[in-house]
Amino acid sequence: LMGGQDKPFLSARPSTVVPRGGHVALQCHYRRGFNNFMLYKEDRSHVPIFHGRIFQESFIMGPVTPAHAGTYRCRGSRPHSLTGWSAPSNPLVIMVTGNHRKPSLLAHPGPLLKSGETVILQCWSDIMFEHFFLHREGISEDPSRLVGQIHDGVSKANFSIGPLMPVLAGTYRCYGSVPHSPYQLSAPSDPLDIVITGLYEKPSLSAQPGPTVQAGENVTLSCSSWSSYDIYHLSREGEAHERRLRAVPKVNRTFQADFPLGPATHGGTYRCFGSFRALPCVWSNSSDPLLVSVTGNPSSSWPSPTEPSSKSGICRHLH
C-alpha cells in the first residue's frame, strides 16, 4: 500500500463514501508508520487546508458537509529534508452523500446468482444525473463510476459485476451526482444484496406432514444438512422475498431449520439454501425443488406466519 518515491499513502476509514453529518478518519501512512502529516484539499488553489495544522496518525473529519467533498492529499513529516515534508501522497477522493434524492438499483437477471456468472446492476433515476456510482458495503476503495445515459426522461447506468466470486457478494448501493459537484452524491439507493450460490453442498428440503396436503392443513418445510450451516434460506418460485431462519443442531448431527407456512391455501415450488455466519451472502447449492400441492379449495396466496425478510438484509447477520 505504501506510495513509492518518498510518497506517503493517504487512506480513509471506514470508507471514502461518507454520509452528510458523518465522520471519516484520514490516515497518512509514511515510511512504515503513521507520522505527523499535513493535509491538502485540492481545490484549484492547492492551498493546505486547516491553516497548516499538523496531525498525528489520523485526522477525524466531521461532521462532514458537502463542502468536504473533494480530492485530498497529505505530506508526511520528513525533518531532515529541505522542506521538512515528503512529496505529496496519492490523491484521495472523499464523496459526501445525501445531497439529492436517491436513485433506484436493480439486478439483472436477479440478485441470486451462481458462482462464475455475471450480473448487471442497473442504477437509474428520473433525476438527470450525470454520473452514477456503485459502492459495496464494507469496502474502502473508491466506488465504480459510470456516465449516466439519458433515455425517455430517465438517466441510468449499467454496472457489470463478474465473473462472480465470493469476494463480490454483498450489499450494494448506488448514488448519482450532477456535473458541477461530482463528489456531492445523492442519498443512497435502497440496498441490494447480491448473493452467490453453488459454493457448498445442497441441503435437503422436506414437507410435514407431506408435499400434498388438504386446504387449511398446517404445513412446515424443513431444511437440513450434515454441513454445519448457520442459516437456512427458503425461497418460493415467483416470490421476490426469501425467508430465513437460524439452523438448529439436531441429535442426529444434522443442522435443521423448520419453516412453518401455516394453514395450506395455495401450492408452490420451494427451494432452500444454507449459509455460514461469516459469509452471509455466499450460499450453498439449491436443494432439490419441492412442489407443495394443496387439494381442496386453493386461494391466491399463502399466509406467512414466518416474517419474510426485507428486500435487503440477507447479507446482514441474523441476531
Epitope: H100, M128, V178, P179, H180
Partner: antibody
Framework: QIQLVQSGPELKNPGETVKISCKAS????????MNWVKQAPGKGLKWMGW????????TYADDFKGRFAFSLETSASTAYLQINNLKNEDTATYFC????????WGQGTLVTVST | DIKMTQSPSSMYASLGERVTITCKAS??????LSWFQLKPGKSPKTLIY???RLVDGVPSRFSGSGSGQDFSLTISSLECEDMGIYYC?????????FGGGTTLEIK
Amino acid sequence: QIQLVQSGPELKNPGETVKISCKASGYIFTNYGMNWVKQAPGKGLKWMGWINTYTGEPTYADDFKGRFAFSLETSASTAYLQINNLKNEDTATYFCAHGPWLAYWGQGTLVTVST
Amino acid sequence: DIKMTQSPSSMYASLGERVTITCKASQDINSYLSWFQLKPGKSPKTLIYRANRLVDGVPSRFSGSGSGQDFSLTISSLECEDMGIYYCLQYDELPYTFGGGTTLEIK
C-alpha cells in the same frame, strides 16, 4: 409539462426589500436545484447562484453574497429570491431556472428600484 | 472563475444562411456547456445541453459541437423566428458563467 411561473413586476424604493417567487409544476420539485439569473437592462445574463431543493442549501456567486437570500416552500413547490436593502443597480429582470444545465426557465420578474 | 468568451457579439445573416456562433472557455469544461436563446418579453429557451444534445422540441436545424475549451452553436438554415440573443453557459464548475451574448439579426 414543466413550467416555472414567477411573481409579477415590482417597483421599490432604495433600502426596501423584495421577495420574488418561482412556482414549479410538471416535475418533482426536489429532483432539481433551482438557479437564479439576473439580467440588468441592456446587459447579459449573470448567474446569481442556486438552491438545492432536496437539502435546502443555498450557494451564492460572489457578487450576490450578503443582501441576497434564496429560500424554499417545498410543500408548495416554490422557490424564492429575496433582495434586502435594495440599490439602484438591483434594477433588473430576475429569472429562475431549474436543473444543472438550466433546462427550463421562468418568464422573469422585473424589479425596478427607483426613488 | 471560468471566463466564457463568445463571438461574434452581433451579426446579420440572411434567411436560409448557415450561422455559427462560438464560445471559448478559459479552461477545460469537459462538455458541460448549454446554449440559450433570448427574445424580448419571453422566457429564455434552452436549445442545447452537454455541448451537443438537443433539448426536446428544439428544431433540428440547431446543433452544438465542441469539447474541452472550444464550442459552437450552428443554425443550418436560418429562419425568421431565430432572431434573438444567444448565450452559452458553462456548468462544469461553480460559479456558473455565461458568455457575453451574440445578437443575431436578419439581413
